[in-house]
Interface confidence: low
C-alpha cells in the first residue's frame, strides 16, 4: 500500500507511515503528504538542509536511505514495484534561495526494474518549473557512483555527485551536493533543475512525490 491508500483509510495527517511493497509483506517507512493538492502523496525524495549525504551506492539508492522526517530517498526498488502495478503521477516541488517555489508535474511516471537499471519513464509535463523537462527525455537509466549507466564518456554520478537519471550529464540532478545560501550559484555539482534556475544554480529544497493517477 502507498500513501494514497493510507489516506483513503482515514489517515489524513501528514507524517511517517509504514507502507508495504505490492504483493508482499515487506514494509518500508515513508513520509506521506496528506494536505498538498488533495493529499495522498508518497514522498520519494526530499532535500532541505544538507544533513544527509546523497553520494550513495547503487544498493543504498535501491533500498533507500536518510530519514523520512527530513532528507531521504525512499528507494528505487519500492518505487519501481509501486509504479509498475498501476499508473502514477510524479510531482516535483522546488524552492530556490530567493523565496520562489515551482513545480513540475508528470501525468505518467514509472521506473523500470533493477534489471533495466531503474530507467525513468515520464509523460505529460505541466507546471511552473520550466516548459521543457529537466529530466531528459526519453528517460535514462539510473546511475550511482558505483553504477555508471549514463550516456557520457565521463561518470556523471562521480562528477556531479549523487544518484540520478543522468544523460550526458543532462539538465537536472536533484541529488547533487547541497550548497548553502550565497554559495549556491555557479555550482555544477549542485541540486540542479536547469529549465527553472539554470545550470549553475543549486536549489534550497526539493521534494519528489508520487500518487496514483486515478486518486
Amino acid at each position: 500500500r502507498d500513501c494514497a491508500e493510507v489516506f483513503k483509510s482515514g489517515h489524513t495527517t501528514n507524517g511517517i507511515y509504514t507502507l508495504t511493497f505490492p504483493n508482499s509483506t515487506e514494509e518500508i517507512k515513508a513520509y506521506c503528504d496528506m494536505e498538498a493538492g488533495g493529499g495522498g502523496w508518497t514522498i520519494i525524495q526530499r532535500r532541505e538542509d544538507g544533513s544527509v549525504d546523497f553520494q550513495r551506492t547503487w544498493k543504498e539508492y535501491k533500498v533507500g536511505f536518510g530519514n523520512p522526517s527530513g532528507e531521504y530517498w525512499l528507494g528505487n526498488e519500492f518505487v519501481s514495484q509501486l509504479t509498475n502495478q498501476q499508473r502514477y503521477v510524479l510531482k516535483i516541488h522546488l524552492k530556490d534561495w530567493e523565496g520562489n517555489e515551482a513545480y513540475s508535474l508528470y501525468e505518467h511516471f514509472y521506473l523500470s526494474s533493477e534489471e533495466l537499471n531503474y530507467r525513468i519513464h515520464l509523460k505529460g509535463l505541466t507546471g511552473t518549473a520550466g516548459k521543457i523537462s529537466s529530466i531528459s527525455q526519453p528517460g535514462n537509466d539510473f546511475s550511482t557512483k558505483d553504477g555508471d549507466n549514463d550516456k557520457c564518456i565521463c561518470k556523471c554520478s562521480q562528477m556531479l555527485t549523487g544518484g540520478w537519471w543522468f544523460d550526458a550529464c543532462g539538465p537536472s540532478n536533484l541529488n547533487g551536493m547541497y550548497y548553502p545560501q550565497r554559495q549556491n550559484t555557479n555550482k555544477f555539482n549542485g541540486i540542479k533543475w536547469y529549465y527553472w534556475k539554470g545550470s549553475g544554480y543549486s536549489l534550497k529544497a526539493t521534494t519528489m512525490m508520487i500518487r496514483p493517477a486515478d486518486f
Epitope: 565521463c154 561518470k155 556531479l160 539554470g198 549553475g200
Partner: antibody, heavy 121, light 106 residues
Framework: EVQLVESGGDLVQPGGSLRLSCTAS????????MTWVRQAPGRGLEWVAN????????YFLDSVKGRFTISRDNAKDLLFLQMNSLRGEDTAVYYC??????????????WGQGTLVTVSS | DIQMTQSPSTLSASVGDRVTVTCRAS??????LAWYQQKPGKAPKLLIS???SLESGVPSRFSGSGSGTEFTLTISSLQPDDFATYYC????????FGQGTMVEIK
C-alpha cells in the same frame, strides 16, 4: 606569462571538418576550465564550448551540439575543438580562452590571438 | 537561455567625457557579470568581473555596478586608449555575451 596559441584554422567547404588546437603555457593548465569563443566577421562574441579541468564535463552552444566536440590533453597542455559538418555560419575567428574559475566557471581572463575558420565553397 | 542586451550599440564621445554603457539580462544573473574591451584585430581583454571587481592592471577610471538584471560600465574620463568595443557577459547560466557597444571618437 600566460599564453594561449591557437592553430588549425583554414578554408573548408560546407560539410567539411576541421580540428583546432590550442597550446597553453605559463599556468597550470590542468587546474582551469578552458573555453572556445568565436567571433564572426564584424560581429559580436559567441561562447561555443567549454570543458572542465579534468575533461569530464563539457558544455556546448545549442547550434554546435552534435557537430563539435571539445577535448583536452592535460599532459601536453593542449585544448582541441573538433568541428564536423561545418556550415557557413560557423565562419569566424575562434579564440582559445582560459576560464578564470577554478571551482566556479566564471569570466574569461586570458585569450589567444584567434584562428580564422572560413566555411565556403 | 539568458539574453544580454547592451545599449547603446554605438556611442560617440570625446576625450575626457564620462561614458556609461548599460547591459540588461533577460533574467536575474545575481552579480555574475563581466565586462570586456576589444580593439580591432585584437582579442578581448577582461576589465571587470563579478559586476564590479576591477581586474588587476585595469585603470581605475573603469568601474562596474549593478546586480540582478541591470548593469553598467562607466568610464569616468575617457582616454584615447579607451576607444574600442565593450562587451558584457553573463556567467550565471551558461555563458552569453551582449552584442557589444562601440565607443568611437565624436
Amino acid at each position: 606569462e600566460v599564453q594561449l596559441v591557437e592553430s588549425g584554422g583554414d578554408l573548408v567547404q560546407p560539410g567539411g571538418s576541421l580540428r583546432l588546437s590550442c597550446t597553453a603555457s605559463g599556468f597550470t593548465f590542468s587546474k582551469y576550465w578552458m573555453t572556445w569563443v568565436r567571433q564572426a566577421p564584424g560581429r559580436g562574441l559567441e561562447w561555443v564550448a567549454n570543458i572542465k579541468e579534468d575533461g569530464n564535463e563539457k558544455y556546448f552552444l545549442d547550434s554546435v551540439k552534435g557537430r563539435f566536440t571539445i577535448s583536452r590533453d592535460n599532459a601536453k597542455d593542449l585544448l582541441f575543438l573538433q568541428m564536423n559538418s561545418l556550415r557557413g555560419e560557423d565562419t569566424a575567428v575562434y579564440y582559445c580562452v582560459r576560464d578564470r574559475g577554478i571551482e566556479v566557471a566564471g569570466p574569461f581572463d586570458y585569450w589567444g590571438q584567434g584562428t580564422l575558420v572560413t566555411v565556403s565553397s | 537561455d539568458i539574453q544580454m542586451t547592451q545599449s547603446p550599440s554605438t556611442l560617440s564621445a570625446s576625450v575626457g567625457d564620462r561614458v556609461t554603457v548599460t547591459c540588461r539580462a533577460s533574467q536575474t544573473i545575481i552579480n555574475w557579470l563581466a565586462w570586456y574591451q576589444q580593439k580591432p584585430g585584437k582579442a578581448p581583454k577582461l576589465l571587470i568581473s563579478k559586476a564590479s571587481s576591477l581586474e588587476s592592471g585595469v585603470p581605475s577610471r573603469f568601474s562596474g555596478s549593478g546586480s540582478g538584471t541591470e548593469f553598467t560600465l562607466t568610464i569616468s574620463s575617457l582616454q584615447p586608449d579607451d576607444f574600442a568595443t565593450y562587451y558584457c557577459q553573463q556567467y550565471n547560466r551558461y555563458w552569453t555575451f551582449g552584442q557589444g557597444t562601440m565607443v568611437e571618437i565624436k
